[in-house]
Interface confidence: low
């Protein structure tokens, strides 16, 4: 559950985040699971720990393995696992499936291809983009921050897109590449002001203290592929990542589904070991797209245990 797959290429930088998150003030210790050997924090090492991040600068095939991170606070320890695989560079152009990040879709009106994992790195624009190993050229392609924007998308634009950037660590530069597939949707779609299907507005969800609870934020945005549509959770008006409660986590990545032809997104909020203070929080499901933003609020209430003796 608290394990994450990460992969990279030899001689490139790879940065991995601990799957268990905590406040910035918490200390995070990293270990190589096979030997239980502590990962050093000194930056002179090729592989070193830096808080929630584990850095391979650069990575080597021999670094492959499972790494344990332990988030330590004054009151608890949380353990996570990073399953790291470093591959040899391919001599030919084909990018194997195991090196591919999630597929994204576009349509003729708009398209954005996000460079995967880039937020973990210290990079500067512009990114370099390649399609099927060829550098992209022409006015239809725009490297915009961490995105590639393709104007007037055609079916021939489908393919594997690789972003390449430089990670800088204390003046030293390391190359990073990441590849994902891009598909082109032909359908005529439309987008609407977000419609939140769940939770209901001002919903009260019953939970049991000490148990785990899940809240799902689900919204529909129109028909066909939607651009710049998102659902997310806030706690007391604060982003989950800023709130700093490691027990409450937003599921990474949004699930896209098509319900009755409508494009919908859902985001699960997982609350581990529900506590009394969780009942005092306001949970907001936010749905936003180019048309606007909509919120539904949920509060938690204690589920009364069933009296089996009556």
């Amino acid at each position: 559950k608290f394990s994450k797959q990460s992969w990279g290429l030899e001689n490139e930088a790879l940065i991995v985040r601990c799957p268990r998150q905590g406040k910035p003030s918490y200390t995070v210790d990293w270990y190589y699971s096979q030997t239980n050997k502590s990962i050093p924090t000194q930056e002179r090492n090729r592989v070193f720990a830096s808080g929630q991040l584990l850095k391979f600068l650069p990575a080597a095939v021999a670094d492959s393995g499972i790494y344990t991170c332990i988030v330590r606070s004054p009151t608890f320890n949380r353990t996570g696992y990073a399953n790291v695989t470093i591959y040899k560079k391919q001599s030919d152009c084909n990018v194997p499936d195991y090196l591919m990040y999630s597929t994204v879709s576009g349509s003729e009106k708009n398209s954005k291809i996000y460079c995967p994992t880039i937020d973990l790195y210290n990079w500067t624009a512009p990114l370099e983009w390649f399609k099927n190993c060829q550098a992209l050229q022409g006015s239809r392609y725009r490297a915009h921050k961490s995105f590639l924007v393709i104007d007037n998308v055609m079916t021939e634009d489908a393919g594997d897109y690789t972003c390449k950037f430089i990670h800088n660590e204390n003046g030293a530069n390391y190359s990073v590449t990441a590849t994902r597939s891009f598909t082109v949707k032909d359908e005529q779609g439309f987008s609407l002001f977000p419609v939140i299907g769940a939770p209901a507005q001002n919903e009260i969800k019953e939970v049991e203290i000490g148990k785990n609870a899940n809240l799902t934020c689900s919204a529909c945005f129109g028909k066909g592929t939607q651009f710049l549509a998102a659902v997310l959770w806030q706690l007391n008006g604060t982003k989950i990542t800023d709130f700093g409660e490691p027990r409450i986590q937003q599921e990474e990545g949004q699930n896209q589904s098509f319900s009755n032809g409508l494009a919908c997104l859902d985001m699960v909020l997982r609350i581990a070991d529900v506590k009394e203070e969780d009942l005092l929080l306001q949970y907001d499901c936010l749905a936003l797209n180019l048309h606007g933003l909509r919120r539904h609020t949920v509060r938690l209430s204690r589920k009364n245990p069933i009296d089996h003796h009556s």
């Epitope: 007391n236 008006g237 936003l288 606007g292 919120r295």
Partner: antibody, heavy 119, light 107 residues
Amino acid sequence: EVQLLESGGGVVQPGRSLRLSCAASGFTFSSYWMSWVRQAPGKGLEWVSSISSDSSYKYYADSVKGRFTISRDNSKNTLYLQMNSLRAEDTAVYYCARDGLRWDAFDIWGQGTMVTVSS
Amino acid sequence: DIQMTQSPSSLSASVGDRVTITCRASQSISSYLNWYQQKPGKAPKLLIYAASTLQRGVPSRFSGSGSGTDFTLTISSLQPEDFATYYCQQSYSTPLTFGGGTKVEIK
């Protein structure tokens, strides 16, 4: 010191265009959503438009949709409002405002720039 | 669109008075309600966000309460510098909307 400074206001004839600028300083401009809010003489506040930190999201009031365009240049720490097909009812003081990082509230405001649309 | 209705539109009060301004939303906005103060010829200033959270640097005599559709801004003991116009604003959904304002004048 955190500061927003609007410029570009003035007197303009109906149907003409004007471009407002807002120079930001004292904070990491590229991390914040930014907005324009206006106030007609003797009237209340009216939200005009908002733009996300990376320009992905742009929202407009119905009264300006199709005529006004919000944009930003993070490299120059500057927010813009391109106003086309101006009408008499667009006459107002235009404020540039910063949206809070953690809450949707306008926590920093500029001093405002006056736009007068008159023939 | 969500309409925000403020009342009263104006009030007269003396220094030291307790002043209450109300704001009503046309639909539930949870606690996505902000309060601003504006003095003549000046830009608005954020007083309270999230219905009841005091913005840094704002005196504690200002307080906010409410949730859903009904909200209140209270000044516990009016000071000379508090004579101004106060606006509520919802940030629940776009388009963002303000109340019509409440002008607090010297009695």
